[in-house]
């Protein structure tokens, strides 16, 4: 089987959503957990993560082979404390298989703006107050 993990971000007003999406087959879901870590280059685990989610075992319909499970971590107002390196990961508690997504970063600037870099999806969002740029 093939399990794919991707990272993305979306902005709603002052809120920043960090999203980990895992695509997998129904039979691959059991025992799998997806999680988001910050500043954990070597020891990212569900226990040290910001948020974790068990993979969906049911896509809700029967006419599909693949399921998408989505973990969303919401930052209501980005501050300098949120600066750092983030990574989406997944781990099977049954087989021990471990997946690691690309690192991405939040950089908070002195002007009160922030930038999210390293994401696969190239987005550019600008806001007048506490501006955020996704690139």
């Amino acid at each position: 089987g093939c399990i794919n993990i991707t990272s993305s971000a979306s902005q709603e007003g002052t809120r920043l959503n960090l999203i980990c999406t895992v695509w997998h087959k129904k039979e691959e879901a059991e025992g799998f957990v997806v999680f988001l870590c910050k500043d954990r280059s070597g020891d990212c685990s569900p226990e040290t993560s910001l948020k974790q989610l068990r993979l969906k075992r049911d896509p809700g319909i029967d006419g599909v082979g693949e399921i998408s499970s989505q973990l969303m971590f919401t930052i209501s107002q980005v501050t300098p404390l949120h600066s750092g390196t983030y990574q989406c990961c997944a781990r099977s508690q049954k087989s021990g298989i471990r997946l690691q997504g690309h690192f991405f970063s939040i950089l908070f600037t002195e002007t009160g703006n922030y930038t999210v870099t390293g994401l696969k999806q190239r987005q550019h969002l600008e806001f007048s107050h506490n501006e955020g740029t996704l690139s």
Partner: antibody, heavy 121, light 107 residues
Framework: QVQLVQSGAEVKKPGASVKVSCKAS????????MQWIRQAPGQGLEWIGA????????RVTQKFRGRATLTADKSTSTAYMELSSLRSEDTAVYYC??????????????WGQGTTLTVSS | EIVLTQSPATLSLSPGERATLSCRAS??????LHWYQQKPGQAPRLLIK???QSISGIPARFSGSGSGTDFTLTISSLEPEDFAVYFC?????????FGGGTKVEIK
């Protein structure tokens, strides 16, 4: 044993909103899709939408998009359906139902008792 | 959207007779079809899953068949408590949909 207990009957005026709750027990709430279905007097069953409490993914049929909001509270194992801009045609019994584990059951194996909504001026 | 068409709309039969209810899908849905029974004032009850698979606690006189677009629910010998409305429902794709129902009434 699995149980779905819905909130009581509601009477609303046209243009108002209603929020129906469905409290689940007897199974892992976050691992099954919760469906919302309605039945107008003397009519058939109409699927409104479904939510997966594990990650809050929701699907709402086109007819109700923008008017029906599905949410779930994992801490209380309760699903909610809010319907806004009510009109007289929304008068119906609203059911929540659990979709059984895919490939094992797949159909809606447990149903709430129904919540009667009356929309009248 | 997959449309499910049930026929007949009403079936008038006597206790002990055999009932054959049809459900036709507007496109192929494999075996992703389920049957429900509903009595007045009650919530529907799942009778058959995945076109032909039995459900625990449901009497053996209820059986289902079919695949693709044409499905059948058969009640081998009607009991007084079987007079009700029957719905089919597909779980193949979003949005999930129901058929319009077949009412089985006493002749």
């Amino acid at each position: 044993q699995v149980q779905l207990v819905q909130s009581g009957a509601e009477v609303k005026k046209p243009g108002a909103s209603v929020k129906v709750s469905c409290k689940a027990s007897g199974y892992t709430f976050s691992e099954s899709w919760m469906q919302w279905i309605r039945q107008a007097p003397g009519q058939g069953l109409e699927w409104i939408g479904a939510i997966y409490p594990g990650d809050d993914e929701a699907r709402v049929t086109q007819k109700f998009r923008g008017r029906a909001t599905l949410t779930a509270d994992k801490s209380t194992s309760t699903a909610y359906m809010e319907l806004s801009s009510l009109r007289s045609e929304d008068t119906a019994v609203y059911y929540c139902a659990r979709r059984g584990i895919a490939a094992v059951v797949g159909g809606f194996d447990y149903w709430g008792q129904g919540t009667t909504l009356t929309v009248s001026s | 959207e997959i449309v499910l068409t049930q026929s007949p709309a009403t079936l008038s039969l006597s206790p002990g007779e055999r009932a054959t209810l049809s459900c036709r899908a507007s496109q192929s849905i494999s075996n992703h079809l389920h049957w429900y029974q509903q009595k007045p004032g009650q919530a529907p009850r799942l009778l058959i899953k995945y076109a032909s698979q039995s459900i625990s606690g449901i009497p053996a006189r209820f059986s289902g068949s079919g695949s693709g677009t044409d499905f059948t629910l058969t009640i081998s010998s009607l009991e007084p408590e079987d007079f009700a409305v029957y719905f089919c429902q597909q779980s193949n794709s979003w949005p999930l949909t129901f058929g319009g129902g077949t009412k089985v009434e006493i002749k």
